[in-house]
Interface confidence: low
């Protein structure tokens, strides 16, 4: 069974300290091999997945994960209690909500149990690794003859999220996008009643509660306006 792992573009707040031991032999010891980097994401502050590329190991190895919180009441070393697997080899650890403390420095340690000196420790700021669920319940209503308002909900504290709205008509090649703050509503002041509009939204844990760079998935799209696009030149081009 192969697992699909979401990987980040990088987290500037991540610091990694690799503790490696070189054995005094001519050949390269297994303990000098770097361990894979651990990537953690906190999904809607409901659970966290910390994953690594298990296939980077020279031979299949069930690496183990320990974690703790630096300089806090939660500084006791904890063992991973729920491993994720890829082709029967450990490739991650899932932590539940009660084990997540967003504003304490999270320390994660990966170790090769066959070679205990081969270990790597990383420190992560979890508030920068939150990915909310996609916005839900998109609704549109007319404010005036030519003005539309888009509203949506998030399963999250509203003030913690910023949003990106994209919209386009059936005539448009590309999306027009607009940033929206935590108030989670968007107005389009000038709507052409002859065109069909599509809207979608995604959200990010930024900037009031954290500095996450990763957006949620896009919401399901919502449509407004005419379904008849007979005079749409791009549709003609597609049908030709």
């Amino acid at each position: 069974l192969n697992t699909t792992i979401l990987t980040p573009n990088g987290n500037e707040d991540t610091t990694a300290d690799f503790f490696l031991t070189t054995m005094p032999t001519d050949s390269l010891s297994v303990s000098t091999l770097p361990l894979p980097e651990v990537q953690c994401f906190v999904f809607n502050v409901e659970y966290m997945n910390c994953t690594w590329n298990s296939s980077s190991e020279p031979q299949p190895t069930n690496l183990t994960l320990h974690y703790w919180y630096k300089n806090s009441d939660n500084d006791k070393v904890q063992k991973c209690s729920h491993y994720l697997f890829s082709e029967e080899i450990t490739s991650g650890c899932q932590l539940q909500k009660k084990e997540i403390h967003l504003y304490q420095t999270f320390v994660v340690q990966l170790q090769d149990p066959r070679e205990p000196r081969r270990q790597a420790t990383q420190m992560l700021k979890l508030q920068n690794l939150v990915i909310p669920w996609a916005p839900e319940n998109l609704t549109l209503h007319k404010l005036s003859e030519s003005q539309l308002e888009l509203n949506w909900n998030n399963r999250f504290l509203n003030h913690c999220l910023e949003h990106l709205v994209q919209y386009r008509t059936d005539w448009d090649h590309s999306w027009t996008e607009q940033s929206v703050d935590y108030r989670h509503k968007f107005s389009l002041p000038s709507v052409d009643g002859q065109k069909r509009y599509t809207f979608r939204v995604r959200s990010r844990f930024n900037p009031l509660c954290g500095s996450a760079q990763h957006w949620s998935e896009w919401s399901h799209p919502i449509h407004w306006g005419s379904n008849t696009s007979k005079e749409n030149p791009f549709l003609f081009a597609l049908e030709a």
Partner: nanobody
Framework: QVQLVESGGGLVQAGGSLTLSCAAP????????VGWFRQAPGKEREFVAS????????YYDDSVKGRFTISRNNAWNTVNLQMNSLKVEDTAVYYC???????????WGQGTQVTVSS
């Protein structure tokens, strides 16, 4: 059920200070985050500041940054909002809210009126 009680509101001149307090009488908040919001007449309720249970996660709306300070006591049953350099536009009803599990603010106080006169 967490009962939240705000206090400390009142009438103050522009440039003055007030300290609002939010309490969960007889118990801790039992939640991950506590926030302050405000609602001026005819306007929507807006976020002011929030603080996490650990006290490390503190955030402010840009309109109050540098003037307002949110803090908590160690027992996690009182959260204060120190408001300095008050402006007329800070006039509003101020609400305290407690959020359980980051999904929503489940518990709200009744609000305390802050009026800033020129």
């Amino acid at each position: 059920q967490v009962q939240l009680v705000e206090s400390g509101g009142g009438l103050v001149q522009a440039g003055g200070s007030l300290t609002l307090s939010c309490a969960a009488p007889g118990r801790t908040f039992g939640t991950d985050v506590v926030g302050w919001f405000r609602q001026a007449p005819g306007k929507e309720r807006e976020f002011v500041a929030s603080i996490s249970r650990s006290g490390d996660g503190i955030y402010y709306d840009d309109s109050v940054k540098g003037r307002f300070t949110i803090s908590r006591n160690n027992a996690w049953n009182t959260v204060n909002l120190q408001m300095n350099s008050l402006k007329v536009e800070d006039t509003a009803v101020y609400y305290c809210a407690a959020g359980d599990g980051w999904s929503t603010y489940d518990y709200w106080g009744q609000g305390t009126q802050v009026t800033v006169s020129s």
